[in-house]
């Protein structure tokens, strides 16, 4: 498939409340574990069924998390990002970037990543 794939990038503030099994999603990425080439950002790799993020409905696999409770996630080691999520408290504010594919294209395989807390 040689056609160009276009993306619509939007940002959203999502307030999540921690459930019995945490925030209910896994993350990948970080300066030591780049998920996207030339991008050390933190991405959602998996939404856990019946967890907080799944029942809330706004966070999606593939979303980039820009900040947690106002704290920027740029240039963090993967484990530091995991710890930040785990220690983020009960009510967590996420600034996320959704990347919606406008034209159909091949979908890459996503690993499960680490729990966000």
């Amino acid at each position: 498939m040689n056609g160009r794939v276009d993306y619509l990038v939007t940002e959203e503030e999502i307030n999540l409340t921690r459930g019995p099994s945490g925030l209910g999603f896994n993350i990948v990425g970080g300066t030591d574990q780049q998920y996207v080439s030339n991008d050390s950002g933190i991405y959602v790799s998996r939404i856990k069924e019946n967890g907080a993020a799944a029942l809330d409905g706004r966070l999606q696999e593939g979303d980039k998390i820009l900040s947690v409770n106002g704290q920027d996630l740029k240039n963090l080691l993967h484990q530091d990002a995991v710890d930040l999520f785990r220690n983020a408290g009960y009510a967590v504010s996420l600034r996320v970037q959704h990347r919606l594919q406008v034209q159909n294209g091949p979908i890459g395989h996503r690993g499960e990543g680490d729990p966000s807390g």
């Epitope: 939404i47 993020a53 409905g57 999606q60």
Partner: nanobody
Framework: EVQLVESGGGLVQAGGSLRLSCAAS??????VGWFHQPAPEKRREVVA?????????YYTHFVEGRFTISRDNAKNTVYLQMNSLTPEDTAVYYC????????????WGQGTQVTVS
């Protein structure tokens, strides 16, 4: 045809209670959520959600302990019991449902007005 019909809204004094109902027809869903929209220019925000299959629940932090979401499988109905209501709870309440376990809610009811004086 999928239909979500809300009922139970109305005018109540601060400190009072209401029970909202969402009757679903046309499909068995994976998740059902209750959202509120305090004003037309504000976005709809989830207040509570439930997994139809597992019964797992999710509450946003500002209603936890006051609101309870439950389901009656035989009646294909989801309820939102709202206690200790405050004027800040005044909003149009929407029932939403999805047949996917994660991602945005695809089906929406028409909404029911709740006014707390």
């Amino acid at each position: 045809e999928v239909q979500l019909v809300e009922s139970g809204g109305g005018l109540v004094q601060a400190g009072g209670s209401l029970r909202l109902s969402c009757a679903a027809s046309g499909r068995t869903f994976s998740r059902v959520g209750w959202f509120h929209q305090p004003a037309p220019e504000k976005r709809r925000e989830v207040v509570a959600a439930i997994s139809w299959r597992s019964g797992d629940t999710y509450y946003t932090h500002f209603v936890e302990g006051r609101f309870t979401i439950s389901r009656d499988n035989a009646k294909n109905t989801v309820y939102l019991q709202m206690n200790s209501l405050t004027p800040e709870d005044t909003a149009v309440y929407y029932c939403a449902a999805s047949d996917k376990s994660t991602g945005p809610y695809e089906y929406w009811g028409q909404g029911t007005q709740v006014t707390v004086s």
